[in-house]
């Protein structure tokens, strides 16, 4: 069975084709080759002789037991080599010779018992080494690591490392890899020698499900003393063994580390006193809790010095009391409990993401809700009922506002966005908004992107609601049940580049409303009920138009619409997916491609 | 279409068939077997995925006695610092995991419950596997 040509001459997918040898009928120009799940078993010298351009090679689960000297020799362009799931028994010293550009080596689940005799010391370009899910017992980083000066990611998770000694990291003292991210999760650790990490700098350290008791966790974290780490991730996994007990003593040792960003990811334990628990983390710049249960929500009003707080997929009794002077970014998403938003006091806040919480807002939105006048980004998407009772007083700095898939109330009672003259992006898609007030978008003089799909309009008519949006470049009016539009609806939108009118109920097409859209490049009228043109004589669309989508409409391929059908043929160079433009009537022409019709007035005679 | 039996409990019988062409082997054990009136137990899965499990989610299509419920999307792996350790599993890596579950106080009427589980993962998104579970429910007391 032949390989699948994904990108001609470049990418070939040969997965699970029962190949016992490397295929010899692929072009020399092949750059990406997936040979996974083939019983190759043995890689001899110059196995990839015929693939001089190869950049990505996937050999996952190829039953490879032996890799000879020079197996990859001549693959000087190879950047990624994947060996996952091969039961390697014999790895020659020169197995990886010739890989002068290799950046990513994945040797997950390959029976690797030690880094010491893993022959990769010459791979100077290596950025990522993944040796997770192996049999490695010692964390001693061999001397050859001093050659791997570009290494950024080292994944040793799911190995057998129990202890870390001072001598294990000696090589890092000789050549501090300032950018190294190290994952040691799922190693059964019970001892870290104090001083082992002294004066070591890491970009990221991940330790999840490493400790089988609170005491072990405590002493191991104390053993990290002296470490300087940009981002520290601690926690557990839901499907692995979890700690019986967890209290404030667990994290006391963190006071002896220098940490920029901290994240606790999943803990099968109720956090009650977070002030004491995170006592050593009051001055990290970014603090993050993922998938934890928090009992006392008042604790977030303590004087933490965080600039970014992230609470994701957590459980709360009620919406937390947030009073944090220095906080600039708050991400509070996909959380449970506390369904009603309550005011927060965050005077420095610039970025606020409250999406996907099922929250309801009794009144939105003004400075008093968030306790800040600095807000630039606000995401309230995928929530419950949001009642618009104020037009963003004190929030004039906003540039990005997202309400999609929340239920907006009182949107057509006043000019909700009047004060948002700096707003660039607005998404009110699928918000149950019924536009019944022409001043709905007044004030949005800087707006560039407006998404309002899935809403509705009074009498299914689009009025002149965009008159102030002179900078608009993108407008989505799809799925709005529209049947008609004002001839001057778009007259002020001279910068508009993309207009989506798809999935509405238009029965005819008219070019007149678009005459002022001098920058329009994309117009999507797919999934309407267009049968014909509104007027006999259709003008041209703006000369800037490059893509016109009229697919999945109800074209009437009859003689009376001959001029419209001819006009469509004349627009052929603009039309996309023409094969999906089919006649709906008459019944004998149903399903015929509109552009293949021979339009003569013999049509129905 | 070959049917794979999972287990029997006092009020349910569970089996599944593949609903995709690939039919890559997957081993599923439930211990103790699910009782629909109340259940607590361990789900054990052994599987070698044909793509990375990063950003794994399930599309669930549930049918209760021929009545179709709306499609439900269950995100399992968000893509970074996920709840489950198997979210970091790579294509070709053995996934051998045990997940605890519990539910109580749900009253199910007698009949045939079907659940099509479409597993989607990776970037670009592609189907990982598709299984159709059939649960025959014989409540002792309804």
């Amino acid at each position: 069975e032949p390989c699948v040509e994904v990108v001609p001459n470049i990418t070939y997918q040969c997965m699970e084709l029962n190949f016992y040898k490397i295929p010899d009928n692929l072009p020399f120009s092949t750059k990406n080759l997936d040979l996974s799940f083939n019983p190759l078993r043995h890689l001899g010298s110059y196995s990839f002789f015929s693939f001089p351009e190869l950049q990505v090679l996937d050999l996952s689960r190829c039953e490879i037991q032996t890799i000879e000297d020079g197996a990859y020799q001549s693959l000087s362009h190879l950047s990624t080599l994947i060996l996952t799931g091969n039961p390697i028994q014999s790895l020659a010293l020169g197995a990886f010779s010739g890989l002068s550009s290799l950046q990513k080596l994945v040797a997950v689940e390959t029976n690797l018992a030690s880094l010491e005799n893993f022959p990769i010391g010459h791979l100077k370009t290596l950025k990522e080494l993944n040796v997770a899910h192996n049999l490695i017992q010692s964390f001693k980083l061999p001397e050859y690591f001093s050659n791997l000066t570009n290494l950024e990611h080292l994944d040793l998770s799911s190995n057998k490392i129990q202890s870390i000694y001072c001598t294990d990291l000696r090589v890092l003292h000789q050549m501090p890899l300032l950018n190294l991210s190290l994952d040691l999760s799922l190693n059964p650790m019970n001892f870290i020698q104090p001083g082992a990490f002294k004066e070591i700098r890491l970009h990221k350290l991940t330790l999840r499900n490493n400790f089988d008791s609170l005491n072990v966790m405590k002493t191991c974290i104390q053993g990290l003393a002296g470490l300087e780490v940009h981002r520290l991730v601690l926690g557990e996994f839901r499907n692995e063994g979890n700690l019986e007990k967890f209290d404030k003593s667990a994290l006391e040792g963190l006071c002896n580390l220098t940490i920029e960003e901290f994240r606790l990811a999943y803990l099968d334990y109720y956090l009650d006193d977070i002030i004491d628990l995170f006592n050593c983390l009051t001055n990290v710049s970014s603090f993050s809790l993922v998938s934890v249960t928090i009992e006392r929500v008042k604790d977030f009003s303590y004087n933490f010095g965080w600039q970014h707080l992230e609470l994701v997929n957590c459980k709360f009794g009620q919406f937390p009391t947030l009073k944090l002077k220095s906080l600039k970014r708050l991400t509070f998403t996909s959380n449970k409990g506390g369904n009603a938003f309550s005011e927060v006091d965050l005077p420095s806040l610039e970025f606020l993401d409250l999406s996907r919480n099922g929250l309801s807002f009794k009144g939105c939105c003004s400075q008093s809700d968030f306790g800040t006048t600095s807000l630039k980004y606000l995401d309230l998407s995928f929530n419950g009922v949001i009642t618009m009772s104020s037009n963003f007083l004190g929030l004039e700095q906003l540039e990005h506002l997202d309400f999609q898939h929340s239920n907006l109330k009182q949107m057509s009672e006043f000019s909700v966005f009047l004060s948002l003259r700096n707003l660039i992006y607005l998404d009110i898609s699928h918000t149950h908004t019924r536009v019944a007030f022409n001043g709905i978008f007044n004030g949005l003089s800087s707006l560039e992107v407006l998404k309002m799909a899935g809403n509705s309009f009074q009498e299914n008519f689009l009025p002149d609601i965009f008159t102030e949006l002179r900078n608009l470049t993108f407008l989505d009016l799809s799925q709005c049940q529209l049947e008609q539009l004002s001839p001057t609806a778009f007259n002020s939108l001279s910068s508009l580049q993309v207009l989506n009118m798809s999935h509405n109920n238009f029965f005819s097409l008219d070019t007149f409303p678009y005459k002022c859209l001098n920058s329009l490049q994309v117009l999507d009228y797919s999934l309407n009920h267009i049968m014909t043109s509104k007027k006999q004589e259709l003008q041209h669309f703006p000369s800037s138009l490059a893509f016109l989508n009229l697919t999945q409409n109800d074209f009437a391929c009859t003689c009376e619409h001959q001029s419209f059908l001819q006009w469509i043929k004349d627009q052929r160079q603009l039309l996309v997916e023409v094969e999906r433009m089919e006649c709906a009537t008459p019944s004998d022409k149903q399903g015929m491609p509109v552009l293949s019709l021979n339009i003569t007035c013999q049509m129905n005679k | 279409q070959k049917q794979y039996w999972v287990c029997n409990s006092s009020d349910a019988s569970i089996s599944y068939t593949y609903c995709d062409k690939m039919q890559y082997p997957i081993s599923i054990n439930v211990n103790p077997c699910i009782e629909l009136k109340r259940s607590k137990g361990l789900l054990h899965i052994f599987y070698i995925p044909r793509r990375d499990l990063k950003q794994l989610y399930f599309n669930l299509y549930i049918t209760v006695n021929t009545m179709n419920l709306p499609k439900r999307k269950e995100v399992i792996c968000r893509g970074s610092d996920d709840d489950y350790s198997f979210c970091r599993a790579l294509k070709g890596e053995t996934v051998n995991t045990t997940i605890s579950f519990s539910f109580k106080g749900i009253k199910f009427s007698k009949g045939k419950y079907k659940c099509v589980v479409e597993a989607i993962s990776g970037s670009p998104e592609e189907m990982l596997f598709c299984l159709e579970f059939v649960i025959l429910h014989q409540p002792n007391s309804n």
Partner: nanobody, 117 residues
């Protein structure tokens, strides 16, 4: 078994030309691809040019594109490498290689090419 014998190497001035030949004998029916590699002192062996016996498709390394030409004479079981506009950095031992259907690679003994004024 496949035997490969190279010839045509030598000393040439920058800008000059040489033509290398590689004669194959033995189980030549099993050969899929043939090619030229080179190895300069202290460097890894690298591809120069490849040719597919079945359909004549060709590959050149970027460093030799437009200057070198690989060709084959099936009747003589010989592959050639015409090298024009030679540069000092082309100095190396040039090896002929043949890959069989079983993925085994056979090598010639090599021929020295020196480009120097």
């Amino acid at each position: 078994e496949v035997q490969l014998v190279e010839s045509g190497g030598g000393l040439v001035q920058p800008g000059g030309s040489l033509r290398l030949s590689c004669a194959a004998s033995g189980s030549i029916f099993s050969i899929n691809d043939m090619g030229w590699f080179r190895q300069a002192p202290g460097k890894e062996r690298e591809h120069v040019a490849l040719i597919r016996i079945k359909d004549g498709s060709i590959y050149y390394a970027d460093s030799v594109k437009g200057r070198f030409t690989i060709s084959r004479d099936n009747a003589k079981n010989t592959v050639y490498l015409q090298m024009n506009s030679l540069k000092p950095e082309d100095t190396a031992v040039y090896y002929c290689a043949a890959k069989t259907g079983t993925s085994f690679v056979y090598w010639g003994q090599g021929t020295q090419v020196t480009v120097s004024s």
